[in-house]
């Protein structure tokens, strides 16, 4: 901000002046520039007990310019804001407050959170989900021969991180107990990995072995993504009798 | 000593034009405000619009469509004319001045004109 | 536009008393308010502009406080010609407005 403070140079009529300094158009010993050039604006500035009138290019923080026909002064913004485009609509909050629609609240709406980075109140963002990949081959220790029982894995991926308060994520990991034909290895074989092992790792933190609570195994097997080829369905028809017991990781 | 002296028809009829001037000494009208505010007898004061120094014009958004203030700084006058009036229009006319936020609103007024509003 | 409420409306002192009129802004006018004195038949005449700041002539007896939304005219002592109506004038932004007025009447 540039300021102007005024001294009376030619005498207009008691206690007023024009062709004062700077940006002031007219001015008095005592009290500074009474009023501004064009574009500028008038603002008070505080020195000790005494409030003296200056111009300015701009407004400092907690006011905004107002413009009338010749006439322009900076004005405060409401007591609870920082910076504002007008009375009515404020940028930016004072500590505490967080900003909505150019309005300074004590808490978020329904619906909205604080985000205490940006002290803003924010749509709440839910976690989003992919579909389920297709499960892995039947696989035991690694390997995709050589066992009748092992077990087989599906993963998806998280499309969209929640918010402080959005619903957390569901598993993005299932495993369940399979059966094979036992078959034995052919040479090289041994120790194959399981197509998806080589496909993806698990997420940093994810426990492969964490067992998740009756609802999301019931949800699990809704799942219609849970698509088999023909190979696999006849494998299954095995376990009829068994359960099918899954693993799932929860994020 | 500034002085400002408001002079115009004192009756004027319903749905016609009030008109009013305001001549002012010891001050040009090319610096400073030169407003209007007027007082409906035994109710408070309302402040009407001004013209600045170069001419330009405010008025109270409650009067807009009704009012004009304009200038003529060769007779160092402003005048104000207020449309379609009705009796709610009767009241004192007053000009006042001010030159700017840091010095007195309205440090001068003149006497006020009464304006009476009637068939 | 900002509102502005003056009280009381009327009040009735002796010589000497002290006299306080207060008026409240419906929003923050950072200390841009003015105090008027007027008389019968008369225009009104400023006495205090800038909340506190006297105009050349006005008596010290009055003087005038206040900040945000509350503002104050205090006459320190009352004098026979200090009865009249005071209206307080608010002028933060456009359209400017008045206050209702208090009338001071002799006791």
């Known amino acids: 901000q540039n300021a102007s403070r005024g001294r009376r140079q030619r005498r207009m009529h008691p206690n007023v002046s024009q062709g004062c300094q700077g940006g002031c158009a007219t001015c008095s010993d005592y009290n500074g520039c009474l009023s501004c050039k064009p574009r500028l604006f008038f603002a008070l500035e505080r020195i000790g007990m005494k409030q003296i009138g200056v111009c300015l290019s701009s407004c400092p923080s907690g006011y905004y310019g107002t413009r009338y026909p010749d006439i322009n002064k900076c004005t405060k913004c409401k007591a609870d804001c920082d910076t504002c485009f007008n009375k009515n609509f404020c940028t930016k909050c004072k500590s505490g407050f967080y900003l909505h629609l150019g309005k300074c609240l004590d808490n978020c709406p329904e619906g909205l959170e604080a985000n205490n980075h940006t002290m803003e109140c924010v749509s709440i963002v839910h976690c989003e989900v992919s579909e389920w990949n297709p499960w892995s081959p039947c696989t035991k220790k690694g390997k995709t021969c050589g066992f009748k029982r092992g077990t087989e894995t599906r993963v998806r991926e998280i499309i969209q991180h929640p918010s402080a308060k959005g619903n957390l994520c569901p598993p993005t990991n299932e495993t369940r107990k399979c059966t094979v034909q036992r078959k034995k290895c052919q040479k090289g074989e041994r120790g194959k990995k399981g197509r998806e092992r080589k496909r993806k790792k698990p997420n940093k933190g994810e426990s492969k072995e964490a067992i998740p609570d009756s609802k999301s195994l019931e949800s699990s097997k809704e799942i219609p993504e849970q698509r088999e080829n023909k190979q696999q369905q006849k494998k299954r028809k095995v376990q009829d009798k068994q359960k099918s017991v899954s693993v799932s990781t929860v994020h | 000593e500034v002085q400002l002296v408001e002079s115009g028809p004192g009756l004027v009829k319903p749905s016609e034009t009030l008109s009013l001037t305001c001549t002012v000494s010891g001050d040009s009208i090319t610096s400073g405000y030169w407003n209007w505010i007027r007082q409906p007898p035994g109710k408070g004061l309302e402040y009407m619009g001004y013209?600045?120094?170069?001419?330009?014009?405010y008025q109270n958004p409650s009067l807009k469509s009704r009012i004009t203030i304009s200038r003529d700084t060769s007779k160092n006058q402003y005048s104000l004319k207020l449309s379609s009036v009705t009796a709610a229009d009767t009241a004192v006319y007053y000009c006042a001045t001010y030159y700017g936020y840091g010095g007195p609103w309205f440090a001068y007024w003149g006497q006020g004109t009464l304006v009476t509003v009637s068939s | 536009d900002i509102q502005m409420t003056q009280s009381p409306s009327s009040l009735s002192a002796s010589v000497g008393d002290r006299v306080t009129i207060t008026c409240k802004a419906s929003q923050d006018i950072d200390s841009y308010l003015s105090w008027y004195q007027q008389k019968p038949g008369k225009a009104p005449k400023t006495l205090i502009y800038l909340t506190n700041r006297l105009v050349d002539g006005v008596p010290s007896r009055f003087s005038g406080s206040g900040s945000g939304q509350d503002y104050t005219l205090t006459i320190s002592s009352l004098q026979p010609e200090d009865f009249a109506t005071y209206y307080c004038l608010h002028y933060d932004e456009f359209p400017l407005t008045f206050g209702q007025g208090t009338k001071v009447e002799i006791k």
């Open positions: 013209i600045s120094y170069s001419g330009k014009t």
